[in-house]
């Protein structure tokens, strides 16, 4: 059974992940990002189901495409460092989902824009955090 310290650690990691995802969303969904209209033509794959930490496998598999799209947005008005940011997210995701369990991600039929994709995973983090508190 999870101890209170492990639950606290999970909660902190989820909060960190949530902040990173929100930072990306705020960074791209900004009139100072003239590349947004181009970024929206890229599609992302959404999880069929995202209710448990193991479902973060679906996020992990989309991190490389996310980094590629974020690279488009780099400019003097846009201060995200895609490689560092995605690397940090990857570390958190690996810790949260655990590396010992092999979970095959199932994707929904409908794809999503980068904004819809980020909102989906932000909602996921908020939902899991609320069950831990």
């Amino acid at each position: 059974a999870p101890t209170s310290s492990s639950t606290k650690k999970t909660q902190l990691q989820l909060e960190h992940l949530l902040l990173d995802l929100q930072m990306i969303l705020n960074g791209i969904n900004n009139y100072k990002n003239p590349k947004l209209t181009r970024m929206l033509t890229f599609k992302f794959y959404m999880p069929k189901k995202a209710t448990e930490l193991k479902h973060l496998q679906c996020l992990e598999e989309e991190l490389k495409p996310l980094e590629e799209v974020l690279n488009l947005a780099q400019s003097k008005n846009f201060h995200l460092r895609p490689r560092d940011l995605i690397s940090n997210i990857n570390v958190i995701v690996l810790e949260l989902k655990g590396s010992e369990t092999t979970f095959m991600c199932e994707y929904a039929d409908e794809t999503a824009t980068i904004v819809e994709f980020l909102n989906r995973w932000i909602t996921f983090c908020q939902s899991i955090i609320s069950t831990l508190t």
Epitope: Y31, T37, R38, T41, F42, K43, E110, T111, T113, V115
Partner: antibody, heavy 125, light 108 residues
Amino acid sequence: EVQLVQSGAEVKKPGASVKVSCKASGYTFTSYGISWVRQAPGQGLEWMGWISAYNGNTNYAQKLQGRVTMTTDTSTSTAYMELRSLRSDDTAVYYCARDLYSLYYYDSSGKFDYWGQGTLVTVSS
Amino acid sequence: SYELTQPPSVSVSPGQTARITCSGDALPRKFAYWYQQKSGQAPVMVIYEDSKRPPGIPERFSGSSSGTMATLTITGAQVEDEADYYCYSTDSGGDVSVFGGGTKLTVL
């Protein structure tokens, strides 16, 4: 109501230039880009390029690079497309079209596009 | 330069299902958009982001995408659906847009 109104038909000689205008109304001009698309008689649609009305950034189709220039005048909410060194195969209907997406993602009208009525440019000696 | 490939023509009888395909190497990661163009008119978008339908477009129009292929489906095609259909997308970098060659749909 969003409208894009283009300038009238033009007849030009080979080697000349043409400048087509596209006046936008019914929305915040600088929140969207404008694409230009042409269609030769009996042919398909050809994307020519795009300009951001926000900052003037442009992307042009490779085959037209060097011959086409797209500009905007934000004071009159007008986009312009100039094509130089005209050839007979530039004879086409030229359309301007508002970008599908706004710079502000949550602008509810963002994803539904609007096109001008088209401008016929005839290149003939 | 990036290309989108469509069949030149598709024919169906009224009430049948018409499927128009569009293939392009970047489509696994780039959305497809579909335009209908009737003779002498400006194009009208019937599907955006692979499968979404703009307001005012009949429910019989639907879109899907799998791998390098996007598909426009007209379920129960009607005579007024006779038109040229173009897929549209961008290259893998997102800057260069391109239309497919177009498909003439005949409903007879």
